[in-house]
Amino acid sequence: DFFRDEAERIMRDSPVIDGHNDLPWQLLDMFNNRLQDERANLTTLAGTHTNIPKLRAGFVGGQFWSVYTPCDTQNKDAVRRTLEQMDVVHRMCRMYPETFLYVTSSAGIRQAFREGKVASLIGVEGGHSIDSSLGVLRALYQLGMRYLTLTHSCNTPWADNWLVDTGDSEPQSQGLSPFGQRVVKELNRLGVLIDLAHVSVATMKATLQLSRAPVIFSHSSAYSVCASRRNVPDDVLRLVKQTDSLVMVNFYNNYISCTNKANLSQVADHLDHIKEVAGARAVGFGGDFDGVPRVPEGLEDVSKYPDLIAELLRRNWTEAEVKGALADNLLRVFEAVEQASNLTQAPEEEPIPLDQLGGSCRTHYGYSS
């Protein structure tokens, strides 16, 4: 197949940087993060979308590994579990140094490309992981967090999630609370990518308006193609274009076809739509492999990216457009975020008001002074 051969040629030079992979969650779920369990060997790991041979076959050159803790940990052990998931990513990279290069910058990604390794970055999936604390946010940055998804599928005290737009959650922050605005400003200051997957439309718009740097949707598709509220509506796609931001398309069947079955061609329809509305510079891939129960026919695991690239070439995407979607768009956005950062600027210090802090098992030190 000419197009498949072309896809491989392009990807040898420009491997894919994927915005969201939940292998760390699988390592917790299957092995309680015991990487030395013989079944957890990533060269032979079975029953997952992701392992080392599949990453190699798929020309995956960069991966934001998802550090995720479920919403029921909010106001409980969310921070502990977040640290444990960051730790498993660090240990995974140290255990397979011939495959993974742990990096925290766009320059690091380029270095991994040169070494033929999978640039491995940490994305923290859900604002509840910071427990409404700017100090925790900064600590997670020091430990390698390079994107923060502002919410998962639950509101935080400072940002609203997508289920507000389905009628399944009540709005609390009308997008971003004043503390949520401080979180966005601190993420900008630190040079952390802001991820708007999982957030409400009001939160998307508020953040796109406030952020001094481009943002990403690490694993979201196009609402006009499938009317799931996990997808990005056209008016927001136009804001994505205005802000030079990025939508990394999720492959979950129910967000692709709005049914339990989907195929590779329908994923390409989402990519086409985002390209049409937001421009080729706004397109990326965030497959959500190992984080979803159903993936499209033709995209069964991470080895299948070249088949998707072949389909885009078949649809007359140019080589430059394809390279943009594979890596260049993410690198551009990441570099813009890094350039907008200012670590010499005074950090945000004003804590969340005590009456906005959820949870009953808390002390109130500092608030009484």
């Epitope: 289920l163 389905t166 009628g167 399944d168 009540e170 009317a227 799931s228 509220r229």
Partner: nanobody
């Protein structure tokens, strides 16, 4: 089997009214927010309206505000969309959906 079945569509003149229904089965209807979306010929999906679990919160697209009313009857496992002052640009297939499933749709045509 989780299912949503829309009904009540048809041909109506501009300025006329229709009431769409959506019958739910296979899940606890009263535990989910519900939404109407529509798709005009050759166009993408467009959000129309959403109602919260209890029915206390309703939201509407600007294009239908003050003309359409969403409601639900949790005892009957049914979602409704009352459409008044219909316009030709309201012509579309109307779908009800929640986070679990989307229905097959019902055609609404507004034409004189």
């Amino acid at each position: 089997q989780v299912q949503l079945v829309e009904s009540g569509g048809g041909l109506v003149q501009p300025g006329g009214s229709l009431r769409l229904s959506c019958a739910a089965s296979g899940f606890t209807f009263s535990s989910y927010g519900m939404t109407w979306v529509r798709q005009a010929p050759g166009k993408g999906f467009e959000w129309v309206s959403t109602i919260s679990i209890s029915g206390s919160r309703t939201t509407y697209a600007g294009s239908v505000k003050d003309r359409f009313t969403i409601s639900r009857d949790n005892a009957k496992n049914t979602l409704y969309l009352q459409m008044n002052s219909l316009k030709p640009e309201d012509t579309a297939v109307y779908y009800c959906r929640n986070i679990l499933v989307q229905g097959q749709g019902t055609q609404v045509t507004v034409s004189s």
